[in-house]
Interface confidence: medium
């Protein structure tokens, strides 16, 4: 008999369902906008916007202060009075659209759908370890705005983006607005514009930079900014658009728009179409040859990775890389394939793509056909040829034109297609330790702490745990607060520890010891915790093996049994060499010889799967009682491993010991050339892992085994004569004495 | 029993480079972390950094980063040290050490080797 | 980088007294500290990890406590083989770092 110990799915180790509580805050309404902010004299403060109102929070989640930011023309509406009396527009509710922080005075910003989409900016001053907001200012001058020319109407009802950066003693605000037709014809926000702020907060400095969908493209090609981000010398936009100026707005895909951080200039505004794709290992028939694309960006996160993934990508240690979530559609509807897929684009890398594309259409030779591209914002032209021109002029540089790069940078899904199921709402990448940890939001509330690597087969979780009760998706925007992130989700905000929320998730010990050292998960005699929850009984040292199984369940009282146990933590080396005197089995009174592995019956455990065997002969003492009885594993001495060494005693019930007897043999006689079927009759004739008839001391080969019957074929005899016919189990012989008579053929 | 055996004393010539072994045996080398730690004369203890020979993966300290290569050769068992650009400030014994489980612990150590770097 | 503070530098001590050693950590590392002996000429010898766990084969007189920032190890009663060198060593981060040691002799 070969029995294997049956495999014990690695998702075993684990119970996602395992409720736990982090702090949160009721915003009183759908969260617009959160954003934090952590000064040097340790205070800080959580700004969380809702519609006609900002909360500022303490880094409790308890309320500091509110501020009424609408409706328009409301006479309790804080903000508004700012801009001295009005009516400065038509009435209606505020829905935030921009929260961001001016980290150089420092200050809150916010703007709005109402008021032309107008900004204020709130002086933040620290209280202790809190923050409270100055009484706004209003960043708008009616003498400088008018409906075509409107350096202070920043945000777009459908959407906008900003990002602050300093350049010298000024802020300048990198804003992106999604537009259409409406939006375009009241107050003219533009598509991509670098506002400076003027230095006695009135507003934005005139005169600014720009880049606006054409008129003709705004109802058929409408860009939607997704993130945006600043790193290095340069801002980055994501954007969501439709493929093509001219072909089926429907068909869309992802960029990247890439702006110069150090000069307020839209000259050197670049643009690349980065390609998200599912390569599954194993290519389904009629599968694209490059992998299923995922042209759409859900949501967006850069950060320094730590080694592993470095590693993986190909770039050292602590270096930029963004990523994204994409989904096959704007609907994100399950196609073939995962309904997310995370793809990972290394800074450097599409710095040198964006460089290497300008080189393309602006150095000999020229490649004829080459288009600049950004239709959508500019007159279509060849390269080397501004928007617009047949030719360079001798005092214009091709390089000081916006262009779109002419190839796309591809990567594909690092989960490998894992993430299955799972709508991915939000996204955000820290570096723990060595550890790259994507946290994601879900569409159906849950927090997946997860770790970002390449090589495996299976997701390596810190965690994966519902916010709340509510179910409600997580929303795009997350914030990061000492070591916490903050997530939204309907009208809460949540805190959740960058750490993972707690270790109850992990329901062995050695799947607890493995965790992640920042996870700070020891064992607490029967659970996985924290050491705040079970200071008596908490260690990160040891863990005790775990029988689950074992085989058979029953030995003859006379006689060995091989016996094989199943669990885990017996060795914790694959070879299965088990160090001299470490382990001790005993069953009943009666030890249990430990055997070296069979080498020939190692089989490779694919990771996904855990369990471990360990062999044992069992010679039952003189004094061993027939009946049920305990299996018992004691494992001292072993060595540490990598993560814990292995200490203690695992008891197993659900063993017998049992006497075989043999009740009768027929027939009793048979041809001296053998194949007489005999049938041996009696009780407990199958317990243990050996048997065997003997007839005249040769084997008769065995056909079948059950408790009260064994039948076996006779081998040819000698001559014709009466023979012994004796059964052993377990090596000993049953009692009773039996002959066979073989006769003439 | 556990036993790190490492390579003998070396004299070298500022500038030069010394490589140090460390021949582990009575365990499974790729069950734990091997670190490396250096002690000038009269001085106290200067952690280097250390390998995981199961994976290569290797951490060090950014005083010694970019002159240290810590290397494990798991068909021998032996894990090495090897120090670059060598000055007079590196004269010291160097000792390798068995990293304990994941604690960051050192439970067994090598007998030391010593290094003089001179002119 | 986290900075392990050990004091005294040396202390001397009679055969049968508590001796106390403290390290200071310069940044919260929880129970992540081990404490070392070494005779001279000779490796160091593991004797406390993880703050308070007694190593394999250490004889009961030694102990550790402590956690965050703050940890004392103690010989309950000095014995003349205890002369040596005591090092603590903090495992929360790389790169890992050791105290100064301190120096024990006997009165």
């Known amino acids: 008999e070969d029995w294997q110990c049956p495999r014990t799915p690695y998702a075993a180790s684990r119970d996602f369902d395992v409720k736990y509580v982090v702090p949160s805050f009721s915003a009183g309404g759908l969260v617009q906008a959160m954003v934090t902010y952590e000064g040097d004299r340790n205070e800080s403060a959580v700004f969380v916007a809702i519609r006609n109102r900002l909360h500022v929070l303490g880094p409790d989640l308890k309320s500091v202060q509110s501020l009424a930011t609408g409706p328009a023309g409301d006479p309790g509406c804080q903000t508004c009075a700012a801009c001295g009396p009005g009516p400065h527009g038509p009435p209606g509710d505020t829905d935030t659209k921009v929260l961001v922080l001016d980290p150089a005075l420092p200050a809150l910003v916010s703007c709005g759908s109402s008021l032309q989409g107008r900004c204020f900016l709130h002086d933040l001053e620290p209280q202790g370890t809190a923050v409270h907001l100055a009484a706004p200012a209003c960043l708008f001058s009616a003498h400088h705005n008018r409906p075509d020319d409107c350096p202070d109407c920043v945000a777009s009802p459908l959407g906008t983006r900003v990002t602050v950066v300093e350049q010298g003693q000024a802020s300048y605000f990198y804003v992106a607005s999604s537009l259409d037709a409406a939006v375009a014809a009241s107050f003219s926000p533009r598509s991509v514009s670098i506002r400076r702020l003027k230095a006695d907060a009135s507003g934005f400095a005139p005169g600014f930079v720009a880049l606006s969908v054409l008129p003709k493209h705004l109802v058929s090609y409408s860009i939607e900014y997704v993130h945006s981000f600043h790193t290095g010398a340069f801002v980055y936009f994501l954007t969501v658009q439709p493929a093509s100026v001219t072909d089926d707005p429907s068909a869309l895909h992802t960029r990247l728009a890439r702006l110069s951080a150090t000069e307020p200039e839209l000259g050197d505004y670049r643009e690349l179409v980065l390609d998200c794709r599912f390569a599954p290992k194993r290519r389904r028939r009629g599968a694209p040859e490059g992998g299923q694309p995922y042209p759409v960006l859900r949501v967006a996160h850069s950060a320094p990775v730590g080694a592993q993934l470095a590693t993986e990508l190909s770039i050292a240690e602590g270096q930029e890389v963004l990523f994204g979530v994409f989904v096959t559609g704007k609907d994100g509807g399950p196609g073939v394939g995962p309904n997310s897929v995370v793809c990972a684009f290394p800074i450097d890398l599409l710095d040198t793509l964006i460089d290497e594309g300008v080189e393309r259409c602006c150095e000999s030779p020229v490649h004829p056909g080459l288009r600049r591209g950004l239709d959508f914002f500019q007159s279509p032209s060849f390269c080397p040829n501004p928007p617009g021109l047949e030719a360079l002029s001798p005092n214009t540089s091709c390089r000081h034109f916006p262009l779109l790069v002419s190839s796309s940078f591809s990567r594909v899904d690092l989960f490998n297609g894992l993430l299955g199921p799972v709508q991915v709402t939000a996204l955000y990448v820290t570096r723990l330790d060595n550890v790259t940890v994507a946290h994601m939001g879900t569409m159906d509330g849950r927090i997946l702490q997860v770790e970002l690597v390449r090589s495996l087969n299976y997701l390596l979780y810190v965690s994966n745990f519902s916010l709340g009760d509510s179910g409600q998706p997580v929303q795009r925007d997350v914030s990061r607060l000492g070591d916490h992130l903050l997530f939204a989700s309907g009208d809460q905000v949540f805190q959740v520890p960058i750490q993972g929320p707690g270790c109850r998730h992990f329901l062995t010990c050695g799947r607890c010891l493995r965790a992640w050292h920042f996870m700070g998960c020891g064992w607490c005699g029967n659970m996985c915790g924290q050491q705040k929850e079970c200071p008596g009984s908490w260690q990160q040292d040891h863990c005790p093996p775990k029988l689950t199984e074992f085989h058979p369940h029953s030995g003859p009282l006379r006689g060995s049994t091989r016996l094989t146990l199943c669990g885990s933590n017996f060795y914790l080396h694959p070879s299965g060499l088990v160090p001299e005197g470490t382990h001790q089995v005993t069953v009943g009174q009666s030890p249990c010889r430990p055997l070296p592995k069979d080498s020939s019956k190692l089989r490779p455990v694919p990771r996904k799967d855990f369990v471990e065997e360990f062999e044992c002969e069992l010679e039952p003492l003189g004094t061993q009682a027939v009946g049920p009885t305990n299996v018992s594993l004691t494992v001292t001495n072993m060595p540490p491993g990598k993560h814990f060494r292995v200490d203690g005693t695992s008891v197993l019930r659900g063993f017998s010991f049992m006497e075989p007897v043999l009740i009768a043999v027929q027939p009793l006689f048979g041809p001296r050339a053998g194949g007489t079927c005999l049938t041996l009759e009696g009780q407990s004739l199958s317990v243990g892992t050996s048997r065997a008839v003997l007839v005249n001391g040769t084997e008769c080969l065995l056909a079948r085994v059950s408790e009260g019957q064994l039948l076996c074929a006779t081998p040819p005899g000698a001559t014709v004569a009466s023979v012994p016919l004796s059964l052993q189990v377990g090596g000993a012989q049953v009692p009773g004495s039996w002959t066979f008579q073989y006769r003439e053929d | 029993q556990v036993q790190l055996v490492q390579s003998g004393a070396e004299v070298k010539k500022p500038g030069a480079t010394v490589k140090i072994s460390c021949k582990v045996s009575g365990y499974t080398f790729t069950d734990t972390y091997i670190h490396w730690v250096q002690q000038a004369p009269g001085k106290g203890l200067e952690w280097m950094g250390r390998?995981?020979?199961?994976?290569?993966?290797?951490k060090s300290d950014p005083k010694f980063q970019v002159r240290v290569t810590i290397t494990a050769d798991t068909s021998t068992d032996t894990a090495y040290m090897e120090l670059s650009s060598l000055r007079s400030e590196d004269t010291a014994v160097y000792y390798c050490?068995?990293?304990?489980?994941?604690?960051?612990?050192?439970?067994?150590w090598g007998q030391g080797t010593l290094v003089t770097v001179s002119r | 980088d986290i900075q392990m503070t050990q004091s005294p530098s040396s202390l001397s001590a009679s055969v049968g007294d508590r001796v106390t050693i403290t390290c200071h950590a310069s940044q919260n590392i929880n129970v992540w500290l081990n404490w070392y002996q070494q005779k001279p000429g000779k490796a160091p010898k593991l004797l406390i990890y993880k703050a308070s766990n007694l190593h394999t084969g250490v004889p009961s007189r030694f102990s550790g406590s402590g956690s965050g920032t703050d940890f004392t190890f103690t010989i309950s009663s000095l014995q003349p083989e205890d002369i040596a060198t005591y090092y603590c060593?903090?495992?929360?981060?790389?790169?890992?770092?050791f105290g100064g040691g301190t120096k024990l002799e006997i009165k």
């Open positions: 060593q903090q495992g929360q981060s790389y790169p890992l770092t």
């Open positions: 390998i995981d020979p199961a994976d290569g993966n290797r």
């Open positions: 050490a068995r990293g304990y489980g994941n604690l960051n612990a050192m439970d067994s």
